[in-house]
């Protein structure tokens, strides 16, 4: 990569030196690499503490990964004239702990946003909607990647992390056009009830590597476009009839359920019956029981009703302390 203070089509990526003159529309910011031909700016692993102000107007793909941004304020990418071409923004691993309302305003073409691997102690409810109106202007976002954004325990706010993320996803119904949502590795214990209802265009939902114990209060009913549902590596014990019926009713879906601690007792009977006849579960013959101990490693598909018993509950008079 060559170093220069103004862009040149001869070098595919240009590392910029600081310049005394006012920034030109196509200048490359200090500590960044730019390619006008690829419409790409990379400011990667440079310990930046704020978003460069002098981003070139041609930027379509902006990588700001591996920095130390800490806070993303309102209008962090607002410029005059606006960055009208910016379509993909990657902020992963940049030590963000706060994303404020309107942080992504004035980016009319922003289709893909990746905030993964940032310990977000505070995510404003209006981070993606830009305003606190009950119905906001639709966000242009199509893909939102929020893997491993859970902060360490000592940095968590009093409110639930799940609730904070959910509020940002549903605010102003701004994300109705979202096709892809990744929420893997966030220690989610539950999925707030109303989130999926506000995301009717979802095609791909990744909730893998969380701590979801149950989907009883989650409705997938209106996700008629859903193609992939990733629930691997959670703490799911069983899927109940309501969930099974909803999943079966989705016309295009493929569900991934590997590595959950399935409890193979009498409550599992409906799920086993469903697994035997459904085509929606990928790799279903690799689902195995984790509990009770006598059933560990048994393949769910090979169980029958006689295998699935529950220990009788003793009446109180017969229970011992």
């Amino acid at each position: 990569t060559s170093s220069a203070s103004s862009s040149s089509s001869s070098a595919p990526f240009l590392a910029s030196a600081a310049s005394a003159q006012p920034p030109l529309p196509d200048q490359c910011p200090a500590l960044c690499e730019c390619s006008e031909a690829a419409r790409t700016v990379k400011c990667v692993n440079r310990n930046l503490t704020e978003v460069p102000t002098d981003l070139p107007l041609y930027v379509r793909n902006l990588f700001l990964t591996g920095n130390q941004l800490a806070v993303l304020p309102a209008g962090a990418f607002a410029r005059r004239p606006p960055l009208a071409e910016l379509a993909a923004l990657n902020l992963s691993g940049s030590r963000l702990d706060e994303v404020r309302g309107g942080a992504f305003e004035h980016l009319p073409s922003l289709r893909q946003l990746d905030l993964s691997h940032n310990p977000l102690a505070y995510l404003s409810p209006f981070a993606f909607s830009g305003s606190n109106a009950s119905i906001s202007a639709p966000s242009p976002l199509v893909e939102l990647i929020l893997n491993h954004i859970v902060p360490p325990d000592d940095k968590r706010q009093n409110r639930s992390f799940e609730g904070m993320v959910a509020a940002a996803l549903v605010a102003g119904r701004a994300l109705q056009g979202l096709h892809l949502l990744e929420l893997a590795s966030n220690h989610f214990l539950y999925l707030p009830r109303d989130v999926l209802a506000q995301l009717p265009s979802l095609r791909y939902l990744d909730l893998s590597n969380n701590s979801l114990v149950s989907l009883t209060y989650v409705s997938f009913r209106n996700l008629t476009h859903l193609e992939s549902l990733h629930l691997e590596d959670n703490a799911l014990k069983v899927l109940h009839n309501g969930t099974l019926a909803e999943l079966q009713g989705l016309p295009h879906v493929r569900v991934f359920l590997d590595n959950n601690p399935w409890v193979c007792d009498c409550h599992m009977a409906d799920m086993v019956t469903w697994l035997k006849q459904t085509g929606v579960v990928q790799g279903k013959d690799r689902l195995t029981c984790a509990f009770p101990e006598k059933m560990r490693n048994r393949v769910l598909l090979e169980l029958n009703s006689a295998d699935l018993d529950c220990d009788p509950i003793l009446p109180p008079s017969l229970q011992t302390s």
């Epitope: 590795s185 590595n259 013959d285 195995t288 984790a290 560990r296 490693n297 048994r298 598909l301 090979e302």
Partner: antibody, heavy 116, light 107 residues
Framework: QVQLRQSGAELMKPGASVKLSCKAT????????IEWVKQRPGHGLEWIGE????????NYNEKFKGKATLTADTSSNTVYMQLSSLTIEDSAIYYC?????????WGQGTTLTVSS | DIQMTQITSSLSASLGDRVTIGCSAS??????LNWYQQKPDGTVKLLVY???SLHSGVPSRFSGSGSGTDYSLTISNLEPEDIATYYC?????????FGGGTKLEIK
Amino acid sequence: QVQLRQSGAELMKPGASVKLSCKATGYTFTGYWIEWVKQRPGHGLEWIGEILPGRGSSNYNEKFKGKATLTADTSSNTVYMQLSSLTIEDSAIYYCARGGRDFDYWGQGTTLTVSS
Amino acid sequence: DIQMTQITSSLSASLGDRVTIGCSASQGINNNLNWYQQKPDGTVKLLVYYTSSLHSGVPSRFSGSGSGTDYSLTISNLEPEDIATYYCQQFIKLPYTFGGGTKLEIK
């Protein structure tokens, strides 16, 4: 109690094929995956692949595709592993194990020696 | 493939010692880790599954712990019959992979 009994030692020539067996007793044979693991002298353990006897479903380590073929006979509760086009590198102890999320019971191993 | 590394290939300890054997994964494996014991005669046994659950019949002096990429097996009070090679194994993703093994010997 759960037991996996493997066939006896084999001495084979390079280029030949061999079929090792693993007979399961003491549990519902069709309800668990059977795993195969290779151990060359002085080396660690290497997963070859697995088969679910009741369905014939199998998964292989990419490294052993074309080398190992797993089959099952539910009438005799036996799983077989055929190794083809043998070379010196195939000389090893081969273990079967009852699988799933862990390999909770293992066979005693079959020693395969490939020598001209 | 996920690489499993047991940095200590051999370990010498005295009877009664507390011994810890380490294992690290090339990426996070979310506690999807098992430990096996292979005796000098070739017999292999499961000791610990899912990081810390003791398999039935395994003495309580064995315990497992860890998270993310780093895991360990501890023998709290070494006995003569514990002389063996110990292997860790990840089961989060096919192909299942094992560590290179740690051979435990008596001083």
